[in-house]
């Protein structure tokens, strides 16, 4: 059962796993949620009645019954982890804590103009977990404006104390705001020879990489496959770090794989969700329960629904025993990973999908693409919306993309002459315009946010956000697309598609069925040559065939230029402008979304 509210002046008795320090009860709840075993917590707020050494302690707890006896205690705040909840969870914490010194290992001390600059520095530093900034009112003149970047083994402070005129906060890496490079490559036959901070068992290098990503100290990893010569090290995932943040030595070794933490791309690829099944593989761990199940998929469901289950092993039924049901072993461990992995025993193993909600919804795999043809099929582009105006009569105005459960990203030029959001309707999950009738449900628009530097499409900043009046419930036919990572600026996208209900030629009409076209990206240099009368800036991106023939056109504006990278779709561009439609040597010009990620996040995450 999901309990989100906090219990004031209440302490949970017993069940202690560990104690960490957090600046607030709210953040204690987040830490509990991300901890592999924590189900409940008790936080101690600052209070004259409480010993100051106990202020800001966050005691993480576990219980077989999922609850613990409650005791009244002033200044104690207790609650439950969000593991029991079905809603989306994020570790992003933008709060700035005034008059708190969050202690850790200070590894960088420098002058910064503001707390915001200090936080940005922390976000863009590979080692930084949190920071403390001495404001310009700080009593010690020489320490004013000093920004201390800090890290710890756990990612949380080792202690928190009151200190006037300082502010503290966390890195915003988990808010997708880091400019650090996102290196997704896994290097075969490679061992990174740097210091190990931890080791866990993993079934493959991908799971190892995902574990590294959400381990606070891990910057890169080495995984020994099941063919690794040393038996005791098979399936071992070594989590590593170095002072420089990069591996100092790479050793060529067969049957080993290495890679990097995906911390700076974690909003656009799954890092918590281990959805694969591992055949002929047994995961060992503490046994929680043994249940009969029809299949390994059913076993995974049982594990996902049991809040304490972290992973499972399913042994298929022997012949016609037990009505064809096999045994489903639900398991857990102290760190969420198997204690040992065995092969050749016939088991099928996997992980709980409970943690998938900690990943961005946009990373969920969608239906396989229909190759060829120009008409889309239902569910092929679930982020695509049709934006209608009701004035003077109802018609399709522009395309747009779902990027959050209350947010549509589109083009600013769509709103020329639109006086009020009241005349707008957003339809999602639509394939054919003819589906839209009087009684078709739609989302009203609460607010239109146009980039304040927008003047006209050709001069850039052609980007706008629509805040919906109600939230979108994600389904197979309506779900968000990932924004590109700022760390992905150098990625060369090769699988890009433009979609919309726009004209198929310059003098045409809005199409009934959602059209799609695969279009190659064009370099900005090449694009500039084709548009000598315009300035093609780095905030624009171009796509099109040299010979023309495929392009976005009138009515597609505001819609997505969607590119698939590492099995995840990213919103690389917003259809903006071009000379004619699909003309030879006249590529389409799109708003380069990666350059506006900060703006998007600033507007959509504003309190």
């Amino acid at each position: 059962e999901c309990v989100t509210q906090l219990l004031k002046d209440t302490c949970f008795e017993g069940g202690d796993i560990t104690t960490v320090f957090t600046p607030s009860a709210k953040y204690c709840q987040v830490v509990c949620t991300y901890h592999p075993r924590c189900l409940l917590f008790t936080f101690t707020a600052e209070s004259p009645s409480e010993d100051p050494t106990r202020w800001f302690t966050c005691v993480l707890k576990d219980s077989v019954t999922e609850t613990l006896p409650r005791v009244n205690r002033t200044a104690a705040i207790s609650g439950y982890s969000f593991k029991q909840c079905s809603h989306q969870i994020s570790a992003c914490n933008k709060d700035i804590y005034v008059d708190l010194d969050m202690k850790g290992i200070n590894y960088n001390s420098s002058v910064a103009k503001s707390a915001q600059e200090c936080q940005e520095r922390c976000t863009d530093d590979v080692h930084c977990h949190f920071f403390t900034y001495a404001t310009r009112q700080f009593p010690s003149l020489e320490h004013r404006n000093i920004c201390l970047l800090k890290h710890t083994q756990t990612g949380t402070p080792t202690r928190i104390t009151k200190l006037d005129k300082v502010v503290s906060g966390f890195s915003l890496k988990s808010c997708a705001l880091s400019n650090l490079a996102c290196i997704r490559d896994i290097f075969p036959n490679t061992v990174f020879a740097d210091s190990n901070i931890d080791s866990v068992m993993a079934p493959d290098a991908f799971v190892c990489g995902r574990i590294c990503t959400h381990h606070p100290g891990c910057l890169f990893f080495t995984f020994f496959s099941q063919e690794w010569p040393k038996e005791s090290q098979r399936n071992l995932c070594l989590l590593k770090t170095s002072e420089s943040g990069l591996p100092s030595t790479r050793i060529k070794k067969s049957k080993a794989l290495s890679g990097f933490s995906l911390q700076s791309c974690r909003h656009s690829i799954p890092v918590f969700c281990h959805s694969s099944f591992y055949h002929d593989t047994d995961f060992l761990g503490e046994e929680l329960d043994i249940v009969a199940a029809k299949s390994h998929e059913a076993c995974q469901k049982l594990c996902t629904n049991a809040v304490r289950c972290q992973f499972f092993t399913y042994t298929p039924a022997q012949a016609s025993c037990n009505e064809g049901k096999g045994k489903c072993y639900l398991k857990l461990s102290s760190n969420g990973s198997p204690t040992k992995i065995l092969h050749g025993r016939g088991g099928i193993s996997g992980y709980t999908l409970r943690l998938c909600k900690m990943d961005n919804e946009c990373t969920t795999k969608i239906k396989p693409r229909i190759v060829g043809g120009t008409a889309s099929v239902r569910g092929e582009w679930p982020w695509q919306v049709t934006l209608h105006t009701t004035s003077p009569t109802q018609r399709h105005l522009c395309g747009g993309s779902i990027i959050g459960n209350q947010w549509i990203l589109t083009a600013a030029h769509c709103f020329y002459g639109v006086e009020s959001p009241k005349i707008l309707r957003v339809y999602s999950g639509i394939l054919n315009q003819s589906e839209i009738k009087e009684d078709t449900s739609f989302f009203g628009v609460q607010e239109i946010i146009i980039h304040d530097q927008y003047k006209m499409a050709e001069s850039g900043y052609d980007i706008a956000l629509l805040k919906l009046e109600t939230t979108v419930n994600y389904t197979d036919s309506q779900r968000p697309i990932c924004l590109p990572s700022k760390g992905d600026r150098n990625v060369i996208y090769t699988d890009c598609w433009v979609t919309g209900w726009g004209y198929r030629k310059l003098r045409d009409k809005i199409q009934n069925t959602l059209q799609k076209a695969k279009i190659p990206l064009v370099t900005n240099e090449e694009c500039q040559k084709r548009y000598r009368g315009h300035k093609i800036t780095h905030k624009m991106i171009c796509a099109g065939y040299r010979e023309g023939g495929k392009d976005a056109c009138k009515g597609d504006s505001g819609g997505p230029l969607s590119c698939k990278h590492n099995e995840v779709w990213h919103l690389v561009g917003i259809t903006s402008w071009g000379e004619g439609c699909a003309q030879r040597e006249r590529p389409g010009v799109y708003t380069n979304v990666v350059e506006y990620v900060d703006w998007i996040l600033e507007k959509t995450q504003a309190v």
Partner: antibody, heavy 116, light 107 residues
């Protein structure tokens, strides 16, 4: 855990130079300032100077011309150099870690005697 | 440069007494004053920083107060192990400077 250890020559002749090393462990020199403080026998504490995490330095005005503080972050070492030593430079020399201008951890100190 | 003056070189006290040591700055140092304890043959130990903040592990019988130019360090109930020399230090502006020290001795 946090430790600071000073090492010096012990005895130096007048007019000679002094070089003392402070070797730290348990923290990074890029994240903390390090101070030098001395204490003549039977007397009080005298602040000599400091080097900040980012490498900036500050010195005691009266000793500025004779003092130089530097560091090697990779070796976790801070160096105090002082020239033209006189007998009144005889003291116990301490290095200490900065905590917002106060000194939260101190070394045990190294004794320097200036004598011919 | 800022000069810190501890008017009493010596102070006599008995176990259980409340004792206050004062320190005066030659100019305004806001609340950037620290207090240290030094026992014979040992390094100084930080007790109080920024006038009133106790360092980790320091017993709550030690307190500090003041602002501007006048500062006070108080031991609410002196224990035998508190007999030592106490120094104030301004950490408002470099060059930082110490007071001359106050020796707390048995009456």
């Amino acid at each position: 855990q946090v430790q600071l250890e000073e090492s010096g020559p012990g005895l130096v002749a007048p007019s000679q130079s002094l070089s003392i090393t402070c070797t730290v462990s348990g923290f990074s020199l890029t994240g903390y300032g390090i101070y030098w403080v001395r204490q003549p026998p039977g007397k009080g504490l005298e602040w000599l100077g400091m080097i900040w995490g980012d490498g900036r330095t500050d010195y005691n005005s009266a000793l500025k011309s004779r003092l130089s503080i530097s560091k090697d972050n990779s070796k976790s070492q801070v160096f105090l150099k002082m020239n033209s030593l006189q007998t009144d430079d005889t003291a116990r020399y301490y290095c200490a870690r900065d905590y917002y201008g106060s000194k939260d951890y101190w070394g045990q100190g190294t004794t320097l005697t200036v004598s011919s | 440069d800022i000069v810190m003056t501890q008017s009493h070189k010596f102070m006599s006290t008995s176990v259980g007494d409340r004792v206050s040591i004062t320190c005066k700055a030659s100019q305004d140092v806001s609340t950037a004053v620290a207090w240290y304890q030094q026992k014979p043959g040992q390094s100084p130990k930080l007790l109080i920083y920024l006038t009133s903040y106790r360092n980790t592990g320091v017993p709550d019988r030690f307190t500090g107060s003041g602002s501007g130019t006048d500062f006070t360090f108080t031991i609410s109930s002196v224990q035998a192990e508190d007999l030592a020399v106490y120094y104030c230090q301004q950490h408002y502006k470099t060059p930082y400077s110490f007071g001359g020290g106050t020796k707390l001795e048995r009456l």
